[in-house]
Protein backbone atom coordinates (compact mmCIF):
# COMPACT_ATOMS: atom_id res chain seq x y z
CA UNK A 1 0.00 0.00 0.00
CA UNK A 2 1.62 3.30 -1.03
CA UNK A 3 2.03 5.83 1.79
CA UNK A 4 -0.06 8.98 1.58
CA UNK A 5 2.21 11.82 0.50
CA UNK A 6 1.58 15.53 0.97
CA UNK A 7 1.16 17.34 -2.34
CA UNK A 8 2.59 20.86 -2.37
CA UNK A 9 2.06 23.58 -4.95
CA UNK A 10 5.72 24.14 -5.79
CA UNK A 11 8.22 22.07 -7.76
CA UNK A 12 9.90 19.19 -5.96
CA UNK A 13 13.50 18.87 -4.90
CA UNK A 14 15.95 19.36 -7.75
CA UNK A 15 16.97 15.99 -9.16
CA UNK A 16 20.32 14.68 -7.94
CA UNK A 17 20.20 17.26 -5.15
CA UNK A 18 22.65 15.50 -2.76
CA UNK A 19 25.17 14.88 -5.54
CA UNK A 20 24.83 18.47 -6.77
CA UNK A 21 25.43 20.01 -3.32
CA UNK A 22 28.42 17.75 -2.67
CA UNK A 23 29.94 18.40 -6.11
CA UNK A 24 29.46 22.17 -5.75
CA UNK A 25 31.08 22.10 -2.32
CA UNK A 26 34.11 20.21 -3.64
CA UNK A 27 34.43 22.59 -6.59
CA UNK A 28 34.12 25.70 -4.40
CA UNK A 29 36.72 24.53 -1.89
CA UNK A 30 39.13 23.70 -4.72
CA UNK A 31 38.74 27.16 -6.27
CA UNK A 32 38.92 29.07 -2.95
CA UNK A 33 42.10 28.13 -1.05
CA UNK A 34 40.88 29.80 2.16
CA UNK A 35 38.04 27.23 2.27
CA UNK A 36 40.22 24.13 1.74
CA UNK A 37 39.72 23.15 5.39
CA UNK A 38 36.00 22.56 4.78
CA UNK A 39 34.88 18.93 4.92
CA UNK A 40 32.23 18.69 2.21
CA UNK A 41 30.71 15.48 3.56
CA UNK A 42 30.09 17.29 6.87
CA UNK A 43 28.62 20.22 4.93
CA UNK A 44 26.20 17.91 3.16
CA UNK A 45 25.28 16.18 6.43
CA UNK A 46 24.56 19.58 8.03
CA UNK A 47 22.54 20.71 4.99
CA UNK A 48 20.53 17.49 5.01
CA UNK A 49 20.01 17.75 8.77
CA UNK A 50 18.36 21.14 8.34
CA UNK A 51 15.31 19.73 6.54
CA UNK A 52 15.24 15.92 6.49
CA UNK A 53 12.53 14.36 8.72
CA UNK A 54 11.11 17.82 9.43
CA UNK A 55 7.77 19.21 8.36
CA UNK A 56 8.59 21.41 5.35
CA UNK A 57 6.37 24.21 6.63
CA UNK A 58 8.01 24.28 10.03
CA UNK A 59 11.66 25.07 9.26
CA UNK A 60 13.50 27.62 11.40
CA UNK A 61 16.74 29.57 11.18
CA UNK A 62 18.09 27.38 13.98
CA UNK A 63 17.76 24.32 11.73
CA UNK A 64 20.45 25.83 9.50
CA UNK A 65 22.87 26.78 12.32
CA UNK A 66 25.15 23.72 11.91
CA UNK A 67 25.43 24.43 8.17
CA UNK A 68 26.10 28.13 8.81
CA UNK A 69 28.88 27.22 11.22
CA UNK A 70 30.61 24.96 8.69
CA UNK A 71 30.17 27.50 5.89
CA UNK A 72 31.55 30.53 7.73
CA UNK A 73 34.09 32.47 5.67
CA UNK A 74 35.82 35.80 5.21
CA UNK A 75 33.83 37.97 2.80
CA UNK A 76 35.34 41.45 2.32
CA UNK A 77 32.63 43.60 3.86
CA UNK A 78 33.37 46.57 1.59
CA UNK A 79 33.14 44.53 -1.62
CA UNK A 80 29.54 43.35 -1.39
CA UNK A 81 27.19 43.51 -4.36
CA UNK A 82 23.49 43.01 -3.68
CA UNK A 83 21.04 42.56 -6.56
CA UNK A 84 17.33 42.43 -7.22
CA UNK A 85 15.68 40.82 -10.24
CA UNK A 86 18.92 40.94 -12.24
CA UNK A 87 20.93 37.99 -10.97
CA UNK A 88 22.63 37.02 -14.24
CA UNK A 89 24.26 40.41 -14.83
CA UNK A 90 25.30 40.66 -11.17
CA UNK A 91 27.02 37.29 -11.47
CA UNK A 92 28.63 38.17 -14.80
CA UNK A 93 29.98 41.31 -13.10
CA UNK A 94 31.54 39.49 -10.13
CA UNK A 95 33.02 36.88 -12.46
CA UNK A 96 34.99 39.72 -14.05
CA UNK A 97 35.43 41.95 -10.99
CA UNK A 98 36.78 39.08 -8.90
CA UNK A 99 37.24 41.09 -5.71
CA UNK A 100 33.49 41.75 -5.42
CA UNK A 101 31.00 39.27 -4.02
CA UNK A 102 27.33 38.52 -4.47
CA UNK A 103 25.70 36.14 -2.00
CA UNK A 104 26.04 33.39 -4.59
CA UNK A 105 29.82 33.90 -4.62
CA UNK A 106 29.94 32.67 -1.02
CA UNK A 107 30.07 28.95 -0.26
CA UNK A 108 26.53 28.77 1.10
CA UNK A 109 25.04 30.83 -1.71
CA UNK A 110 26.96 28.84 -4.30
CA UNK A 111 25.71 25.53 -2.88
CA UNK A 112 22.03 26.49 -2.99
CA UNK A 113 21.81 28.75 -6.05
CA UNK A 114 18.85 27.80 -8.28
CA UNK A 115 18.11 24.63 -6.29
CA UNK A 116 14.90 23.49 -4.57
CA UNK A 117 14.77 21.07 -1.64
CA UNK A 118 12.41 19.73 1.02
CA UNK A 119 11.79 16.64 3.07
CA UNK A 120 8.84 15.04 4.81
CA UNK A 121 7.91 14.91 8.47
CA UNK A 122 9.10 11.72 10.19
CA UNK A 123 10.71 10.10 7.14
CA UNK A 124 14.29 10.34 5.98
CA UNK A 125 13.16 10.75 2.37
CA UNK A 126 13.81 13.78 0.18
CA UNK A 127 10.61 14.89 -1.58
CA UNK A 128 11.31 14.99 -5.32
CA UNK A 129 7.62 15.32 -6.22
CA UNK A 130 6.67 18.69 -4.74
CA UNK A 131 7.79 21.28 -2.19
CA UNK A 132 5.85 24.09 -0.48
CA UNK A 133 5.33 27.27 -2.47
CA UNK A 134 6.05 30.44 -0.47
CA UNK A 135 2.71 32.06 -1.40
CA UNK A 136 0.35 29.13 -1.89
CA UNK A 137 1.56 26.85 0.92
CA UNK A 138 3.80 28.39 3.61
CA UNK A 139 6.67 30.82 4.08
CA UNK A 140 8.66 28.74 6.59
CA UNK A 141 9.72 26.21 3.98
CA UNK A 142 13.34 24.97 3.68
CA UNK A 143 14.29 27.08 0.65
CA UNK A 144 12.70 30.36 1.81
CA UNK A 145 14.09 30.09 5.34
CA UNK A 146 17.56 29.37 3.98
CA UNK A 147 17.60 32.39 1.65
CA UNK A 148 16.04 34.71 4.21
CA UNK A 149 18.65 33.68 6.77
CA UNK A 150 21.72 33.99 4.55
CA UNK A 151 20.42 37.19 2.90
CA UNK A 152 19.93 38.83 6.29
CA UNK A 153 23.37 37.81 7.47
CA UNK A 154 24.97 38.90 4.19
CA UNK A 155 23.47 42.38 4.61
CA UNK A 156 24.56 42.45 8.26
CA UNK A 157 28.13 41.62 7.21
CA UNK A 158 28.36 44.55 4.78
CA UNK A 159 30.32 47.73 5.48
CA UNK A 160 31.50 51.05 4.01
CA UNK A 161 30.03 51.37 0.47
CA UNK A 162 27.52 48.66 -0.47
CA UNK A 163 26.39 48.33 -4.08
CA UNK A 164 23.06 47.04 -5.34
CA UNK A 165 22.21 46.22 -8.94
CA UNK A 166 18.57 46.89 -9.86
CA UNK A 167 16.61 46.02 -13.00
CA UNK A 168 15.52 49.21 -14.76
CA UNK A 169 13.22 47.23 -17.08
CA UNK A 170 10.86 46.22 -14.27
CA UNK A 171 7.73 48.20 -13.44
CA UNK A 172 9.01 48.38 -9.85
CA UNK A 173 12.73 49.03 -10.14
CA UNK A 174 12.90 48.83 -6.35
CA UNK A 175 10.39 46.31 -5.04
CA UNK A 176 9.68 46.34 -1.30
CA UNK A 177 8.57 42.71 -1.55
CA UNK A 178 11.81 41.40 -3.06
CA UNK A 179 14.48 39.81 -0.85
CA UNK A 180 16.50 42.99 -1.25
CA UNK A 181 13.54 45.21 -0.34
CA UNK A 182 12.14 43.14 2.51
CA UNK A 183 15.28 41.67 4.09
CA UNK A 184 18.59 43.15 2.99
CA UNK A 185 17.70 46.85 3.06
CA UNK A 186 16.50 46.56 6.66
CA UNK A 187 19.56 44.64 7.85
CA UNK A 188 22.32 46.94 6.60
CA UNK A 189 24.01 48.23 9.77
CA UNK A 190 24.21 52.05 9.90
CA UNK A 191 27.22 51.93 12.23
CA UNK A 192 29.11 49.92 9.59
CA UNK A 193 27.61 51.02 6.25
CA UNK A 194 28.26 54.55 5.06
CA UNK A 195 26.60 54.48 1.62
CA UNK A 196 24.29 52.31 -0.44
CA UNK A 197 24.97 52.89 -4.13
CA UNK A 198 22.29 51.69 -6.55
CA UNK A 199 23.18 50.77 -10.11
CA UNK A 200 20.03 50.91 -12.25
CA UNK A 201 20.49 48.70 -15.30
CA UNK A 202 18.73 49.89 -18.45
CA UNK A 203 17.14 47.38 -20.82
CA UNK A 204 16.45 49.30 -24.05
CA UNK A 205 19.31 50.42 -26.27
CA UNK A 206 17.85 53.89 -26.84
CA UNK A 207 16.69 54.39 -23.27
CA UNK A 208 18.29 57.62 -22.08
CA UNK A 209 15.90 58.39 -19.22
CA UNK A 210 17.31 59.04 -15.77
CA UNK A 211 15.86 56.05 -13.95
CA UNK A 212 17.42 57.28 -10.69
CA UNK A 213 14.44 59.66 -10.60
CA UNK A 214 11.97 56.75 -10.65
CA UNK A 215 9.44 56.92 -7.77
CA UNK A 216 10.50 53.50 -6.45
CA UNK A 217 14.15 54.63 -6.33
CA UNK A 218 13.06 57.70 -4.39
CA UNK A 219 11.24 55.34 -2.02
CA UNK A 220 14.45 53.32 -1.58
CA UNK A 221 16.39 56.54 -0.94
CA UNK A 222 13.87 57.52 1.71
CA UNK A 223 14.09 54.14 3.50
CA UNK A 224 17.90 54.19 3.43
CA UNK A 225 18.18 57.83 4.55
CA UNK A 226 15.86 57.17 7.49
CA UNK A 227 18.30 54.47 8.55
CA UNK A 228 21.15 57.04 8.61
CA UNK A 229 22.85 55.56 5.57
CA UNK A 230 23.76 57.76 2.60
CA UNK A 231 22.29 56.89 -0.79
CA UNK A 232 23.62 57.36 -4.29
CA UNK A 233 22.37 56.15 -7.66
CA UNK A 234 23.90 55.60 -11.11
CA UNK A 235 22.28 54.75 -14.42
CA UNK A 236 23.96 51.93 -16.35
CA UNK A 237 22.62 52.77 -19.82
CA UNK A 238 24.58 50.07 -21.66
CA UNK A 239 25.05 46.93 -19.55
CA UNK A 240 26.98 45.19 -22.35
CA UNK A 241 29.43 48.08 -22.55
CA UNK A 242 29.51 48.28 -18.75
CA UNK A 243 30.73 44.67 -18.53
CA UNK A 244 33.18 45.23 -21.38
CA UNK A 245 34.64 48.23 -19.57
CA UNK A 246 34.97 46.27 -16.33
CA UNK A 247 36.99 43.73 -18.32
CA UNK A 248 39.04 46.38 -20.15
CA UNK A 249 39.00 49.65 -18.19
CA UNK A 250 41.83 51.12 -20.32
CA UNK A 251 39.67 51.00 -23.46
CA UNK A 252 39.31 54.55 -24.84
CA UNK A 253 35.52 54.18 -25.17
CA UNK A 254 35.22 53.54 -21.43
CA UNK A 255 35.73 57.14 -20.34
CA UNK A 256 32.27 58.19 -21.56
CA UNK A 257 29.10 57.45 -19.63
CA UNK A 258 27.94 53.84 -19.75
Amino acid sequence: VPRWRQQWSGPGTTKRFPETVLARCVKYTEIHPEMRHVDCQSVWDAFKGAFISKHPCNITEEDYQPLMKLGTQTVPCNKILLWSRIKDLAHQFTQVQRDMFTLEDTLLGYLADDLTWCGEFNTSKINYQSCPDWRKDCSNNPVSVFWKTVSRRFAEAACDVVHVMLNGSRSKIFDKNSTFGSVEVHNLQPEKVQTLEAWVIHGGREDSRDLCQDPTIKELESIISKRNIQFSCKNIYRPDKFLQCVKNPEDSSCTSEI
Epitope: T106, R153, E156
Partner: nanobody, 115 residues
Amino acid sequence: QVKLEESGGGSVQTGGSLRLSCAASASIFTRLPMGWYRQAPGKQRELVVGIVPSGRINYADSVKGRFTISRDNAKNTVYLQMNSLRPEDTAVYYCRADTFPLPTWGQGTQVTVSS
Protein backbone atom coordinates in the same frame (compact mmCIF):
# COMPACT_ATOMS: atom_id res chain seq x y z
CA GLN B 1 39.65 29.70 8.99
CA VAL B 2 39.96 32.80 11.16
CA LYS B 3 40.95 32.39 14.81
CA LEU B 4 41.08 35.20 17.36
CA GLU B 5 42.98 35.30 20.62
CA GLU B 6 42.60 38.00 23.27
CA SER B 7 45.17 38.90 25.91
CA GLY B 8 45.94 41.73 28.32
CA GLY B 9 43.13 41.30 30.83
CA GLY B 10 43.68 41.45 34.56
CA SER B 11 42.76 43.18 37.80
CA VAL B 12 43.11 46.92 38.29
CA GLN B 13 41.98 49.63 40.71
CA THR B 14 39.33 52.22 39.80
CA GLY B 15 40.91 54.88 37.58
CA GLY B 16 43.55 52.48 36.29
CA SER B 17 44.34 51.43 32.72
CA LEU B 18 44.65 48.22 30.72
CA ARG B 19 45.46 47.47 27.11
CA LEU B 20 43.78 44.46 25.53
CA SER B 21 45.10 42.80 22.38
CA CYS B 22 43.30 40.62 19.86
CA ALA B 23 45.55 38.66 17.53
CA ALA B 24 44.01 37.24 14.36
CA SER B 25 45.31 34.13 12.60
CA ALA B 26 45.02 35.84 9.20
CA SER B 27 45.18 39.28 7.65
CA ILE B 28 41.53 40.33 7.99
CA PHE B 29 41.40 43.92 9.24
CA THR B 30 41.34 45.40 5.74
CA ARG B 31 38.41 43.13 4.88
CA LEU B 32 36.22 42.65 7.95
CA PRO B 33 34.53 44.74 10.61
CA MET B 34 36.11 44.05 13.99
CA GLY B 35 34.68 44.69 17.42
CA TRP B 36 35.30 44.48 21.14
CA TYR B 37 32.36 43.21 23.17
CA ARG B 38 31.96 42.57 26.87
CA GLN B 39 29.78 40.44 29.08
CA ALA B 40 29.32 41.15 32.77
CA PRO B 41 28.02 38.36 35.05
CA GLY B 42 24.28 37.83 34.51
CA LYS B 43 24.14 40.35 31.67
CA GLN B 44 23.90 40.22 27.88
CA ARG B 45 27.02 40.55 25.76
CA GLU B 46 27.26 44.17 24.56
CA LEU B 47 29.25 46.06 21.95
CA VAL B 48 32.04 48.21 23.40
CA VAL B 49 33.51 49.49 20.14
CA GLY B 50 33.54 48.50 16.47
CA ILE B 51 35.81 49.44 13.58
CA VAL B 52 35.34 48.86 9.84
CA PRO B 53 38.08 48.63 7.17
CA SER B 54 37.69 52.30 6.17
CA GLY B 55 38.55 53.25 9.75
CA ARG B 56 35.10 54.41 10.89
CA ILE B 57 34.75 53.74 14.62
CA ASN B 58 31.60 53.32 16.70
CA TYR B 59 31.98 53.56 20.50
CA ALA B 60 29.31 52.66 23.05
CA ASP B 61 28.23 55.80 24.95
CA SER B 62 29.43 54.33 28.25
CA VAL B 63 33.08 54.17 27.10
CA LYS B 64 33.38 57.28 24.91
CA GLY B 65 36.39 59.38 25.89
CA ARG B 66 37.86 56.56 28.00
CA PHE B 67 38.44 53.66 25.60
CA THR B 68 40.33 53.75 22.28
CA ILE B 69 40.46 51.09 19.58
CA SER B 70 43.42 50.82 17.23
CA ARG B 71 44.80 48.23 14.86
CA ASP B 72 48.15 47.12 13.49
CA ASN B 73 47.52 45.52 10.11
CA ALA B 74 51.11 44.26 9.87
CA LYS B 75 50.75 42.35 13.14
CA ASN B 76 47.14 41.28 12.47
CA THR B 77 46.26 42.69 15.87
CA VAL B 78 43.56 45.03 17.13
CA TYR B 79 43.96 46.79 20.49
CA LEU B 80 41.63 48.25 23.10
CA GLN B 81 43.22 50.89 25.29
CA MET B 82 41.05 51.28 28.41
CA ASN B 83 41.65 54.30 30.65
CA SER B 84 39.81 55.67 33.71
CA LEU B 85 38.41 52.22 34.42
CA ARG B 86 35.34 51.89 36.64
CA PRO B 87 33.90 48.95 38.60
CA GLU B 88 31.06 48.73 36.06
CA ASP B 89 33.68 47.94 33.36
CA THR B 90 34.25 44.57 35.07
CA ALA B 91 33.44 41.86 32.51
CA VAL B 92 34.85 39.28 30.16
CA TYR B 93 36.02 41.14 27.04
CA TYR B 94 35.68 39.41 23.69
CA CYS B 95 37.10 40.20 20.28
CA ARG B 96 34.84 39.54 17.27
CA ALA B 97 35.36 39.47 13.51
CA ASP B 98 32.28 39.78 11.31
CA THR B 99 32.82 36.72 9.16
CA PHE B 100 29.86 35.49 7.08
CA PRO B 101 27.34 34.06 7.88
CA LEU B 102 28.37 33.72 11.54
CA PRO B 103 30.77 36.02 13.40
CA THR B 104 34.01 34.61 14.76
CA TRP B 105 34.67 35.16 18.48
CA GLY B 106 37.77 34.88 20.62
CA GLN B 107 37.69 32.99 23.91
CA GLY B 108 37.61 36.19 25.99
CA THR B 109 39.82 37.84 28.62
CA GLN B 110 38.69 38.80 32.12
CA VAL B 111 38.90 42.42 33.26
CA THR B 112 38.20 43.15 36.94
CA VAL B 113 38.04 46.70 38.31
CA SER B 114 37.89 47.06 42.09
CA SER B 115 37.07 50.22 44.03
